[in-house]
Interface confidence: low
């Protein structure tokens, strides 16, 4: 038992050192774009980076290179900085990330923010087959057409649970939705993409109406849709909300994991120390009993 103790102590110390080594980088900051990650050409956008109070420096990186630096004053009162882009263009579109520093300690880099410039060049045409009003269970396909040179198309549905679907084709891409349910109801638009971060003007919206029986409707409520002028806002809440929640979960999960591991190591060490102490105590007691018994035996022998 006593020989295993140093080994366990070593394991414990190594683990705790590993845990403290993991703390040598600060948690990653949140990054998001306001009002939206999809920015019309020549419009303004603000990239926000939220780290920790006390951060003395924030760095915004674009496509892997340092893009801008901000040093908040006073750092202990500020946990978020904003990088303003007054005039969006294709050169500013791409992947952004940010990091921050507290003292000499740097954070992990944030998640990547894909900043997209829209309203480039042309406007695609969005059509739906067999038509905008269908019965639940019917197969529906969207067609996005753009005659200028592009091979990638994007279909977006307005609403909280919006997803960007990619399609490919020389001048037209098709987006088969398969047999639709009332959950597919909503307003759709498409874009032509000249590269991952430069998109065309949005198409005119197409509103898909799916009629079904009452049970279906109650089981699959329609996504909240927004008028055309808030096209830009609906995704903002989804994107940034999800991103923040995800990053927050990352922090919490990591910290819980680290704390849990440290606690387990501590419990194990205490248990083994107690076990070792009890073991030694038992050995001493046995030795004591043995010596007492030996003394009595000798005494008896002498008496005899």
């Amino acid at each position: 038992m006593s020989s295993t103790l140093p080994a366990l102590l070593c394991v414990g110390l190594c683990l705790s050192q590993r845990i403290s080594a993991q703390q040598q980088t600060l948690p990653k900051p949140f990054i998001w774009a306001e009002p939206h990650f999809m920015v019309p050409k020549e419009k303004q956008v603000t990239i926000c980076c939220q780290g920790n109070y006390g951060a003395v420096e924030y760095q915004l990186h674009f496509e892997g290179s340092l893009f801008a630096v901000d040093r908040p004053k006073p750092p202990e009162r500020i946990n978020k900085v904003q990088f303003y882009i007054p005039d969006m263009n294709s050169r500013m579109a791409g992947q952004y990330s940010c990091i921050y520093r507290v003292g000499e300690l740097w954070s992990e880099p944030s998640n990547l923010l894909d900043l997209v410039v829209t309203e480039m060049y042309d406007t695609p045409t969005l059509s739906v087959h067999p038509g905008p009003e269908v019965i639940s269970g019917e197969k529906v396909t969207f067609y996005c057409r753009l005659d200028t040179a592009t091979s990638m198309f994007l279909l977006l549905k307005e609403g909280r649970s919006s997803h960007v679907q990619r399609g490919y084709g020389k001048v037209q891409a098709e987006f088969p939705l398969g047999p639709v349910t009332t959950a597919h109801r909503g307003t759709y638009r498409c874009f032509g993409s000249y590269n991952n971060h430069a998109w065309s003007f949005p198409s005119e919206p197409v509103k898909l109406l799916v009629t079904g029986d009452i049970e279906n409707t109650s089981l699959a409520p329609e996504d909240p849709t927004f008028p055309a002028d808030t096209w830009g806002t609906y995704l903002l809440t989804t994107e940034t909300g999800l991103q923040k929640d995800h990053a927050l979960w990352d922090h919490t999960a990591q910290n819980l994991l680290r704390m849990g591991l440290a606690f387990l190591v501590l419990v194990a060490l205490v248990w083994f120390l107690v076990e070792d102490w009890l073991s030694r105590k038992r050995t001493r007691e046995r030795a004591s009993r043995a010596s007492t018994w030996e003394g009595r035996r000798r005494l008896n022998t002498q008496t005899l």
Epitope: G64, S65, L66, F67, V69
Partner: nanobody, 124 residues
Framework: EVQLVESGGGSVQAGGSLRLSCAAS????????MGWFRQAPGKEREGLAT????????AYADSVKGRFTISQDNAKNTLYLDMNTLKPEDTAMYYC?????????????????WGQGTLVTVSS
């Protein structure tokens, strides 16, 4: 991406002069810092001169101070290195590099964009 293409290298007698050019194309708005470097055979790459493209501030290595001049032509997106009083030890492959400034100063190493280089040979 930023593309950099050097030109103007060649052979010259000691004491002579050369002008190197570096044509930048692509997303040059991302190149706050531009610089000239050289690498002689069997030696490490050496920084010679840098320029802050936004305001024209320059900095030189001691080995070339007073002999080499870095300049830029923003209209042509071109960087220059005027080399005077050349010595045989200036023989090397000369590279143009570009990057963003880091916290107000050009990076000391690890620049992002590099040209292919142009060879300068100085004979005695």
């Amino acid at each position: 991406e930023v593309q950099l293409v050097e030109s103007g290298g060649g052979s010259v007698q000691a004491g002579g002069s050369l002008r190197l050019s570096c044509a930048a194309s692509g997303y040059t708005y991302r190149t706050d810092c531009m610089g000239w470097f050289r690498q002689a055979p069997g030696k490490e790459r050496e920084g010679l001169a840098t320029i802050y493209t936004s305001d024209g501030r320059t900095a030189y290595a001691d080995s070339v101070k007073g002999r080499f001049t870095i300049s830029q032509d923003n209209a042509k997106n071109t960087l220059y290195l005027d080399m005077n009083t050349l010595k045989p030890e200036d023989t090397a492959m000369y590279y143009c590099a570009a990057d963003l400034q880091y916290g107000g100063s050009c990076p000391s190493g690890g620049w992002k964009y590099w040209g292919q280089g142009t060879l300068v040979t100085v004979s005695s």
